[in-house]
């Protein structure tokens, strides 16, 4: 994401347009405690980070709160007074949206509708992935709005189901990250189960009169 | 169908002020944020900040502080870009465009769109 | 800032002919470029944005390719409305132009 700078390697997420993160790797200065110093506004003086994030004992990288900044981050990442890596970005272009929250599921025969509540911004895709054990791969299917009716189901089989929210590309770019994936939960005949039998259930035999 | 339309040509003496009014619809005004940009004569494009319609809060590019001054009139959704003690170097043309993609709630990106038809603002004594 | 260096500063093609403009960011900007066309006395015209995307309306005679600092809008077949002056934009950071290319009609 960020191009070297002095071998300083950097990672940007904004998380869910509230916090940002920013991480380095600098193995030139792996032993070093680097101070991150960000501004907002381009002729603004810079503020230092007041919650590093730290690795064996070192600082790695920030967490700053920046939500709903809707702006451009200025940052310099300093050993002492000397800056090692001094950029500016979009915050918008590494956007992770929130994990889906009171995802719901409803049964009508062989079909069931996903809804979860939509994030406040748009421009979003939620995605649900699906699997039976007899599957060897998830299927996939993605909406707009979190409301997606997957059809052509097997009531008799058992389903997985999860869940998680993507930027859309065309509008913030391939540098985003797709929130994290909800929790699994399974469902057989319209009816939630603790898990899906890894093995696929032989058919029972059908029991003579 | 998305407008953007700006007022007319100014002349204006050095040290005086100008007001250059953008006037937007075809969409909901707040659902987007506007940035204006120069264009010195003979010159390239030249990004002078953006105003977030729906906060009101104004973001200036670097060299762009102090004389430069982003306003919005959101009930006839309307912004406005102000120049104080103008000089002879501010002769240029000046533009409104409209962020193309990111909404305000995510706020700006800098792909614009949307234009003004520009304004002309000459500074000479 | 991000500098955008534009070639050819001007170019004379005749209709018909491929056309290429290229453009290079003084660091890394991945795809976060646009292109714009502006004709005298308009304002500029998104062309391409994502370095490669057609904007909404342009011909696809227009293309753009590149990634990281070296990019190129393309040309396939000239027609003599495209007479212009086309500018590179970045956007990885606040907006920065190419200073343009003029491009004229042999």
């Known amino acids: 994401q960020g191009g070297a700078a002095e071998g300083v390697q950097i990672q940007i997420i904004y998380f869910n347009l509230e916090t940002v993160q920013v991480t380095w790797n600098a193995s030139k200065y792996s032993r070093t405690n680097l101070t991150f110093h960000y501004r907002f506004n381009g002729d603004e003086a810079y503020d230092q980070c007041t919650n590093y994030l730290l690795q064996e004992g070192h600082t790695s990288g920030c967490l700053l709160d920046a939500e709903q900044r809707d702006d451009i981050l200025y940052f310099s990442i300093r050993n002492g007074t000397h800056p090692v890596f001094t950029a500016s970005r979009w915050m918008v272009y590494y956007l992770k949206p929130s994990s889906p929250k009171h995802v719901r599921f409803s049964w009508h025969q062989d079909a069931v509708t996903v809804t979860c509540s939509d994030l406040s911004y748009g421009d979003l895709l939620y995605e649900v992935q699906y699997r039976s054990p007899f599957d060897t791969e998830w299927q996939s299917k993605q909406e707009n709005t979190c409301n997606v009716t997957i059809e052509g189901l097997d009531a008799e089989k058992c389903y997985s189901f999860w869940v998680r929210v993507k930027a859309m590309e065309d509008v913030y770019g391939p540098d985003t990250y797709p929130s994290d994936w909800s929790e699994v939960t399974c469902w057989q005949r319209g009816e939630i189960r603790d898990a899906c039998a890894e093995t696929p259930t032989p058919p029972k035999p059908k029991l003579s009169k | 169908q998305v407008q953007l339309v700006q007022s007319g040509a100014e002349v204006k003496k050095p040290g005086a002020s100008v007001k250059v009014s953008c006037k937007a619809s075809?969409?909901?005004?707040?659902?987007?944020?506007i940035s204006w940009l120069r264009q010195a004569p003979g010159q390239g494009l030249e990004w002078m900040g953006w105003?977030?319609?729906?906060?009101?809060?104004?973001r200036y590019a670097q060299g762009f502080t102090g004389r430069f001054v982003f306003s919005l009139d959101t009930s006839v959704s309307t912004a406005y870009l102000q120049i104080s003690s103008l000089k002879a170097e501010d002769t240029a043309v000046y533009y409104c465009a409209r962020e193309g993609f990111i909404t305000t709630v995510v706020g700006a990106a800098g792909r614009f769109v949307y234009w003004g038809q520009g304004t002309l603002v000459t500074v000479s004594s | 800032d991000i500098q955008m260096t534009q070639s050819p500063s001007s170019l004379s093609a005749s209709v018909g002919d491929r056309v290429t403009i290229t453009c290079r960011a003084s660091?890394?900007?991945?795809?976060?470029l646009a292109w714009y066309q502006q004709k005298p006395g308009q304002p500029p015209k998104l062309l391409i944005y994502w370095a490669s995307t057609r904007g909404s309306g342009v011909p696809d005679r227009f293309s753009g390719s590149g990634s990281g600092t070296d990019f190129t809008l393309t040309i396939s077949s000239l027609r003599a409305e495209d007479v212009a002056v086309y500018y590179c934009q970045q956007y990885s950071t606040y907006p920065t132009f190419g200073q343009g290319t003029k491009l004229e009609i042999k």
């Open positions: 075809g969409y909901t005004f707040t659902t987007y944020g």
């Open positions: 660091q890394d900007i991945h795809t976060r």
């Open positions: 105003v977030n319609t729906n906060t009101g809060n104004p």
